[in-house]
């Protein structure tokens, strides 16, 4: 009876999300393997988040708008492990917008989700950021490694969206 009611709850939650995400990919987790964590298909999952690599080329504002339409934000990178996971799925000859910008050009970088910008957990390429006119951050592959670079926000780039996993 308990299992039945849990299944009914799950199905109704799935139906609720169905209107936003036609397909979800879920895995069982938790100490009793009773919880399901889901990401929209074909997003990838890492820890408690889902990621989507957008290959359409858009300015930073439009890229954030595009993520937002999908219930996400441009990616906020909190750890080296997270960055290493994300970069496995990126193309080395492309650049991707991050959810990091310096709106006034005062070198006050801020994340889209208001996570505090921690200088000790940043992965700028050597010599970057290098221009107060370049107020948005991308991740690209340079000198044999992935790192961040400041660029002009209005030049179209690919992007990475991130959202919290859906628990049912």
């Amino acid at each position: 009876n308990f299992m039945y009611s849990k299944t009914v709850k799950r199905l109704s939650k799935l139906q609720e999300y169905q209107q936003y995400y036609p397909s979800l990919t879920c895995v069982m987790e938790g100490k009793d393997m009773e919880d399901w964590s889901c990401c929209p298909t074909p997003w990838t999952s890492f820890q408690s988040s889902c990621y989507f690599i957008s290959t359409v080329m858009q300015s930073w504002t439009k890229s954030q708008n595009n993520c937002s339409v999908m219930g996400a934000d441009l990616v906020v990178i909190n750890t080296k492990e997270e960055q290493d996971f994300i970069t496995q799925n990126l193309k080395i000859n492309s650049a991707y917008f991050l959810g990091l910008s310096d709106p006034k050009g005062w070198r006050h970088w801020q994340w889209v989700d208001q996570t505090p910008y921690n200088k000790n957990v940043t992965f700028w390429h050597s010599g970057e950021p290098n221009s107060p006119d370049e107020r948005c951050a991308i991740i690209n592959f340079r000198s044999e490694e992935w790192g961040w670079n400041d660029v002009h926000c209005h030049v179209p780039q690919k992007s990475i969206c991130k959202m919290k996993k859906i628990y049912i």
Epitope: Q58, S59, T61, K62, V69, H152, H154, V155
Partner: antibody, heavy 120, light 107 residues
């Protein structure tokens, strides 16, 4: 004010390459923005062909990807269009334009255009 | 690619009249739409960006509206210099495609 001017041969033979230059004055092409080639066919249809960004990256329209190359000479503040294996279908007026104005909401600055005819 | 369908293809009107040109996108372009005016033998001139914002110096008789996939350009009290061709262009995702154009002719 920024000004753009296209130049190049007005007549190209089929199967040859079309090469055009866009000379920019009043703004450095390495400072910001992205620098486009757009063409307008005889029936007036407009097509974005591709661009080169201020930092030297390219985007090419998928329909032209195998034939197009956009390069630049930063010392002369010029960017170039090269289109290979042209046919009579490539007859058009070719414009260069700056992209990224109004937070990338419209092309505010254009050259006056140059007519290229592909004919034997 | 997002396709832009513009209508009508041609339009005849008199000085002083009001005309409306429409543009339909094949997908939601989130108000990232520009309108241009082009005179014979000249390059297109940007009139409107982001669907409804007028470029500095463009007369207030021009106005843009719309959302989602449907947009329009309205010209009140047509002036002789308004005749020529009008084009819409979306700016949502690259490539930024144009509508087929509307030729506005004087009666």
């Amino acid at each position: 004010d920024v000004q753009l001017q296209e130049s190049g041969p007005g007549l190209v033979k089929p199967s040859q390459s079309l090469s055009l230059t866009c000379s920019v004055t009043g703004y450095s092409i390495t400072s910001a923005y992205y620098w486009n080639w757009i063409r307008q066919f005889p029936g007036n249809k407009l097509e974005c062909m591709g661009y080169i960004t201020y930092d030297g990256n390219n985007y090419y329209s998928p329909s032209l990807k195998n034939r197009i190359s956009i390069t630049r000479d930063t010392s002369k503040n010029q960017f170039f269009l090269n289109l290979n294996s042209v046919t009579t279908e490539d007859t058009a007026t070719y414009f260069c334009a700056r992209g990224g104005d109004y937070d990338d909401g419209g092309f505010a600055f254009w050259g006056q255009g140059t007519l290229v005819t592909v004919s034997a | 690619d997002i396709q832009m369908t513009q209508s009508p293809a041609s339009l005849s009107a008199s000085v002083g009249e009001t005309v409306t040109i429409t543009c339909r996108a094949s997908g939601n372009i989130h108000n990232y739409l520009a309108w241009y005016h082009q005179k014979q033998g000249k390059s297109p001139q940007l009139l409107v960006y982001n669907a409804k914002s007028l470029v500095d110096g463009v007369p207030s008789r021009f106005s843009g509206s719309g959302s989602g996939t449907q947009y329009s350009l309205r010209i009140n009290s047509l002036q002789p210099e308004d005749f020529g061709s009008y084009y819409c262009q979306h700016f949502w995702i690259v490539p930024y495609t144009f509508g087929g154009g509307t030729k506005l002719e004087i009666i």
